[in-house]
Interface confidence: medium
């Protein structure tokens, strides 16, 4: 539930659709000009838990292109540049909102969808399970 | 641009608004039930570049609550549990889509907005600038 201080200049909404269906202006207000994660930083190469970026494309989704991180190694890169399997490279995941065309192929009708994406990788100490 | 084979059952859209303004169903299709990042994993504590999660709250935005990562240290945690300043903890950032109420305070009218959020931190080798 979101607190909504009602503005008298709002578009009308029929009760049967409210608050499920809303109008959304797709002219994105973008505070960030760089949308290619490969150009935004080279952390994916310099990290001790490096990752590759894979392009996930779906024309029925908005945005249609999402970049997914896949950790390169199970372990982490140590000071000598070797993979240390005493540590683990793990993906950092985030839930993001996307718009899914609904009904399919409709240009102006969408449904909000939450998807889980891997944004990058981090190096963690493994959880050790001791066997009695 | 993406070619969209038009579905005859789509809602109508007036040309003057098309394709800027679309209808969006806010009944989120959610494949992931856990939305609190503190509960989803303990990577933020176990990472060699640990981070804290800060709650960013804005009722004029959807989603109104977003969790932001802030790296705990400039350096990374070494095998002894100490901060090693020869390495750097850096935030992994991602651009995400949110809905911003427009006009302000309207319950059923939004504009898409891209915001940059820090999702977690990773440990990177620093860039060394050699002075001639």
């Amino acid at each position: 539930g979101i607190t909504i201080p009602r503005n008298p200049g709002c578009p009308n909404s029929e009760d049967k659709n409210f608050p499920r269906t809303v109008m959304v202006n797709l002219n994105i207000h973008n505070r960030n000009t760089n949308t290619n994660p490969k150009r935004s930083s080279d952390y994916y190469n310099r990290s001790t838990s490096p990752w590759n970026l894979h392009r996930n494309e779906d024309p029925e989704r908005y945005p249609s292109v999402i970049w997914e991180a896949k950790c390169r190694h199970l372990g982490c890169i140590n000071a000598d540049g070797n993979v240390d399997y005493h540590m683990n490279s793990v993906p950092i995941q985030q839930e993001i909102l996307v718009l899914r065309r609904e009904p399919p192929h409709c240009p102006n009708s969408f449904r909000l969808e939450k998807i889980l994406v891997s944004v990058g990788c981090t190096c963690v100490t493994p959880i050790v399970h001791h066997v009695a | 641009g993406i070619t969209i084979p038009r579905n005859p059952g789509c809602p109508n859209s007036e040309d003057k608004n098309f394709p800027r303004t679309v209808m969006v169903n806010l009944n989120i299709h959610n494949r992931n039930t856990n939305t609190n990042p503190k509960r989803s994993s303990d990577y933020y504590n176990r990472s060699t570049s640990p981070w804290n999660l800060h709650r960013n709250e804005d009722p004029e935005r959807y989603p109104s609550v977003i969790w932001e990562a802030k790296c705990r240290h400039l350096g990374c945690i070494n095998a002894d549990g100490n901060v090693d300043y020869h390495m750097n903890s850096v935030p992994i950032q991602q651009e995400i889509l949110v809905l911003r109420r427009e006009p302000p305070h309207c319950p059923n009218s939004f504009r898409l907005e891209k915001i940059l959020v820090s999702v977690g931190c990773t440990c990177v080798t620093p860039i060394v600038h050699h002075v001639a």
């Epitope: 539930g1 607190t3 | 503190k38 800060h54 804005d58 305070h105």
Partner: antibody
Framework: EVQLVESGGGLVQPGGSLRLSCAAS????????MAWVRQAPGKGLEWVAT????????YYRDSVKGRFTISRDNAKNSLYLQMNSLRAEDTAVYYC??????????????????WGQGTLVTVSS | DIQLTQSPSSLSASVGDRVTITCRAD??????MHWYQQKPGKAPKLLIY???NSEIGVPDRFSGSGSGTDFRLTISSLQPEDFATYYC?????????FGQGTKVEIK
């Protein structure tokens, strides 16, 4: 522990002005929406105004719009209510209120979990 | 504005009684309904938030239920310290509104 302490109440003539203050402690003040709620003698509770953490967004009940101004100074952990053109019907105990600190759900924390002791404003000639 | 109507306005009950106070909104407030207890000369105290969540430190004899427009606060076994006035609050839309209050008195 969250503490809210109001001050600035008193007796004022109709048409006069008063500035209420609320000193907050025990939490990261700038992260939270804050509000003023009032209660006329022997009556129920009435929400007056709310302000966002940054101070950039404010909301008022219609009867005080244009007369009252809610503001905050995050550097001083202080919330204010500037009351102008006071009327007899503004007579009340004014409470400063803040949201919960521990709630981690996805709904904005805009209800009032913590309250000050209140400060009495009496508008009378 | 969303109007909240509490009933009853007052009630007399004995220690150990089960007491239910209702709050009806004239339009849906979804789950954004909260309950407060106030004693004379004191600030209100949050009991229940978001319909049914108990505030830390609130005895488990207090419970909340309902959705949309109809909500209930139940005290399963009234104790001497529970004699007070109870208010519901909606934070679904501005202006936030409180119910008119329900005074619980000793029979």
């Amino acid at each position: 522990e969250v503490q809210l302490v109001e001050s600035g109440g008193g007796l004022v003539q109709p048409g006069g002005s008063l500035r209420l203050s609320c000193a907050a402690s025990g939490f990261r003040f700038s992260d939270y929406y804050m509000a003023w709620v009032r209660q006329a003698p022997g009556k129920g509770l009435e929400w007056v105004a709310t302000i966002s953490g940054s101070g950039g967004t404010t909301y008022y009940r219609d009867s005080v719009k244009g007369r009252f101004t809610i503001s905050r100074d995050n550097a001083k952990n202080s919330l204010y209510l500037q009351m102008n053109s006071l009327r007899a019907e503004d007579t009340a105990v004014y409470y400063c209120a803040s949201p919960p600190q521990y709630y981690e759900g996805s709904i904005p924390r805009l209800w009032f979990a913590h309250w000050g002791q209140g400060t009495l404003v009496t508008v009378s000639s | 504005d969303i109007q909240l109507t509490q009933s009853p306005s007052s009630l007399s009950a004995s220690v150990g009684d089960r007491v239910t106070i209702t709050c009806r909104a004239d339009e849906s407030v979804r789950t954004l309904m909260h309950w407060y207890q106030q004693k004379p000369g004191k600030a209100p105290k949050l009991l229940i938030y978001l319909v049914s969540n108990s505030e830390i430190g609130v005895p488990d004899r207090f419970s909340g239920s309902g959705s949309g427009t109809d909500f209930r606060l139940t005290i399963s076994s009234l104790q001497p310290e529970d004699f007070a006035t109870y208010y519901c609050l909606q934070t679904h839309s501005y202006p936030y509104t409180f119910g008119q209050g329900t005074k619980v008195e000793i029979k």
